[in-house]
């Protein structure tokens, strides 16, 4: 059997890739099934008319070439066509109708625009399952896509609108990727995803959504990616009926709270990722803590870390005690108990919680003060922390545990005057350890240090509020204060003066 001299032929696999070819070589054997022609300089003129006679060819790799039109003269029974990284601008019915058995079409990194896809171009493509159009020039989703499509990738285009009808017939679609486009909520036609009854994965990462989309298909959606948008609102019905959803990611948005019960329908959720949102841990978010504490072990929730108000900044929502949510109508006030070894005059904390004090403040209304814990009794997992400023940029943290623990989460945060200021650093320390040296801090700056037991379960039997302490790094002239905090040393609770 012949093989073009510039190629290598091996049992139906024809390797003509990376040869600087400007045309497809003549003499490809008739039993060829796969043509590797990638990484050449083949242009449209260089596709010979007799290529269509190779009726056994099922896969053609023509990516990274010099095609500026959709190629013609392709073998009729081709199933996989890889045309990435060319300069193809148009998709016509004439070219697609000649390869009606196509199942996968890879057109990533070309120059296809919405107007350059001929209306009805895909009307005879009744076997097409995968259509990849990432990194093209699309401003909208092309209409008239075949209803056989199972995966549609349109990431990194310029899509600002999706028309209601464009996706409506795609009842076989399982995976839709729209990352890195220009979509806002106005650009999403009404019920645009609603009829995608087999959709299991929807990705809208890196767009301009300000609200989580509604009317999502509930029958089969399993993964929903909404990270890196501008979402500041989740409509109460956004996740209704999404009973199959197991992964939801809304990281890197602008969410400060969530409507109560928003996750009620998510019967199968196992991964909920909400990192890097400005969560405001006020009364509206108390339900989230209660919900988190009721979750089974299999549910993995990440990123619910308070950014405001300042008194709880840096704390995990699930670790907050009920009193810290400031639900004024509940009659609950803070009952955190703190002692300190810092003299009054030495580097007092700057109005952050918990404020180191040396005496109990006056209690205006003792009847209002009640220590509400989930078990009705104080937590027995007492941690006594001592913090010492060793050098202007280093603090030494040591702790004692009343009960043995497998691990603890240690975090520290430079305090500032706005929620956007400062970043939380955390580390996991094993239960056997009793000290930790934090370096590379800023001199003469206030820090909050928190410790909390690391639980293996999300079912809480004790009050797991973090034990926190504030300290200040020494000025460049050396000073070594020592601060001690223990939630259970005080005999009587008192109202935190910094709380309203």
């Amino acid at each position: 059997k012949s093989c073009p001299s510039v190629c290598r032929c091996d049992a139906g696999f024809i390797y003509c890739n990376d040869r600087s070819l400007t045309s497809i070589p003549v003499g490809i054997p008739e039993d060829a099934t796969t043509l590797y022609l990638q990484n050449n300089q083949i242009n449209n003129v260089g596709i010979p008319s007799d290529l269509k006679n190779l009726l056994k060819v099922q896969r053609i790799y023509l990516y990274h070439n010099s095609l500026d039109e959709f190629p013609t003269n392709l073998p009729k029974y081709v199933k996989e066509l890889h045309l990435q990284e060319n300069n193809i601008r148009t998709i016509t019915y004439d070219s697609l109708s000649k390869i009606p058995y196509l199942e996968e079409l890879h057109l990533d990194d070309n120059s296809v625009s919405a107007v350059s896809i001929e209306e009805g171009a895909f009307r005879d493509s009744n076997y097409l399952r995968l259509l990849f159009l990432s990194r093209n020039h699309l401003s909208t989703i092309p209409g008239g896509l075949p209803r056989t499509i199972e995966e549609l990738r349109l990431d990194d285009n310029r899509i600002s609108t999706i028309s209601s009808p464009s996706l409506h017939g795609l009842t076989s679609l399982k995976r839709l990727v729209l990352d890195g486009n220009l979509l806002n909520n106005h650009g999403l036609g009404d019920k645009v995803f609603f009829n995608l009854v087999n959709l299991t994965e929807l990705s809208l990462v890196r767009n301009s959504l300000t609200a989580a989309p509604v009317n999502l298909p509930g029958t089969s959606l399993r993964k929903l990616y909404l990270q890196d948008n501008h979402i500041n609102r989740v409509p109460p019905n956004a996740f209704s009926y999404l009973r199959q959803l197991y992964r939801l990611d809304m990281s890197n948005n602008n969410l400060s709270n969530l409507p109560q019960g928003i996750f009620d329908d998510l019967d199968n959720i196992t991964q909920l990722i909400l990192r890097n949102n400005p969560w405001y841990c006020g009364c509206k978010m108390k339900w989230v803590r209660d919900w988190l504490q009721s979750l089974p072990v299999k549910v993995n929730v990440r990123g619910l870390m308070c950014q405001a108000p300042e008194k709880v900044r840096g704390m995990a929502i699930k670790d907050l005690s009920a009193e810290l949510f400031d639900c004024k109508d509940s009659g609950i006030v803070s009952t955190i108990q703190i002692t300190t070894a810092i003299p009054n005059t030495a580097y007092p904390a700057q109005g952050q919680w918990p404020a180191p004090v040396t005496k109990q403040p006056d209690i205006k209304n003792p009847k209002l003060i009640k220590d509400q814990r989930t078990t009705g009794s104080p937590s027995r997992k007492t941690i006594l922390i001592t913090v010492k400023s060793v050098t202007p940029d280093t603090i030494h943290i040591s702790w004692r545990l009343a009960l043995p623990m497998t691990a603890l989460r240690l975090s520290w945060l430079k305090l500032g005057h706005s929620p956007a200021f400062g970043s939380i650093t955390e580390t996991i320390v094993t239960g056997e350890r009793s000290e930790y040296l934090v370096t590379a801090l800023e001199p003469e700056s206030p820090y909050r240090v928190c410790m909390v037991p690391m639980e293996t379960s999300n079912l809480y039997l004790f009050d797991e509020t973090p034990v926190c302490i504030e300290t200040q790094t020494a000025p460049l002239r050396m000073y070594n204060p020592t601060t001690t905090l223990n939630r259970e040393q005080e005999k009587e609770p008192y109202k935190n003066p910094n709380l309203p």
């Epitope: 919405a114 107007v115 209306e119 009805g120 009307r123 401003s139 909208t140 209409g143 008239g144 209803r147 600002s160 609108t161 028309s163 209601s164 009808p165 464009s166 409506h168 017939g169 009842t171 106005h186 650009g187 999403l188 036609g189 009404d190 019920k191 645009v192 009829n195």
Partner: antibody, heavy 120, light 107 residues
Framework: QVQLQQSGPELVKPGASVNISCKAS????????MNWVKQRPGKGLEWIGW????????NYNGKFKGKATLTADKSSSTAYMQLSSLTSEDSAVYFC?????????????WGQGTLVTVSA | DIQMNQSPSSLSASLGDTITIACRAS??????LSWYQQKPGSIPKLLIY???NLHTGVPSRFSGSGSGTDFTLTISSLQPEDIATYYC?????????FGSGTKLEIK
């Protein structure tokens, strides 16, 4: 070729209901959305909604929810629109219209229209 | 709902003239716009779809342009048979909405 044949004119009393039909031929009826459009005498066009005969799934203009009910019978390739609780405001010509390619938003094929007159 | 603002509401021109009809959407509809011609007592007829694509059988003197929110229908070399009412339709979002129509008359 695509053809849409609508039922004849209807004279109905206020409060009653009416059923309009649209028989399709020349294409795969189950695969293309069927739209319905209202035109009052001397006035413009209003989109009522569309139905996908393949599974009976319908989408309505909110203005016509409760007023219009769209159904389809695949076996006879016929789409139906029922209008209920009729008032004089419902007196109009009603068109069925098919999209150019199955389910896009432009209507290339139109029925001849059915005139509904609501009068006591 | 997306509003379609069509202007002018009526237009009088001479045979052979070039006329334009404008349609403005209340929000971005990309290229999801079509134009229809309706003669008195007749059904609407598709002229232009996808903002600029001429439908089969429509004379080439009809053309459409625009994207986003602003669209125009142009009829060059006006003919007597062009006397009709013209409508735009947005197909971007449910509910689909028509413009209010432009009635074209011959001077």
């Amino acid at each position: 070729q695509v053809q849409l044949q609508q039922s004849g004119p209807e004279l109905v009393k206020p409060g009653a209901s009416v059923n309009i039909s649209c028989k399709a031929s020349g294409y795969a009826f189950g695969n293309s959305w069927m739209n319905w459009v209202k035109q009052r005498p001397g006035k413009g066009l209003e989109w009522i909604g569309w139905i996908y005969p393949g599974d009976g799934n319908a989408n309505y203009n909110g203005k016509f929810k409760g007023k219009a009910t769209l159904t389809a019978d695949k076996s006879s390739s016929t789409a139906y629109m029922q209008l209920s609780s009729l008032t004089s405001e419902d007196s109009a010509v009603y068109f069925c219209a098919r999209a150019l390619y199955d389910y896009d938003g432009w209507f290339a094929y139109w029925g001849q229209g059915t005139l509904v007159t609501v009068s006591a | 709902d997306i509003q379609m603002n069509q202007s002018p509401s009526s237009l009088s021109a001479s045979l052979g003239d070039t006329i334009t009809i404008a349609c403005r959407a209340s929000q971005n509809i990309d290229i999801w716009l079509s134009w229809y011609q309706q003669k008195p007592g007749s059904i609407p007829k598709l002229l232009i779809y996808k903002a600029s694509n001429l439908h089969t059988g429509v004379p080439s003197r009809f053309s459409g342009s625009g994207s986003g929110t602003d669209f125009t229908l142009t009829i060059s070399s006006l003919q007597p048979e062009d006397i009709a009412t013209y409508y735009c339709l947005q197909g971007q979002s449910f509910p689909f909405t028509f413009g209010s129509g432009t009635k074209l008359e011959i001077k």
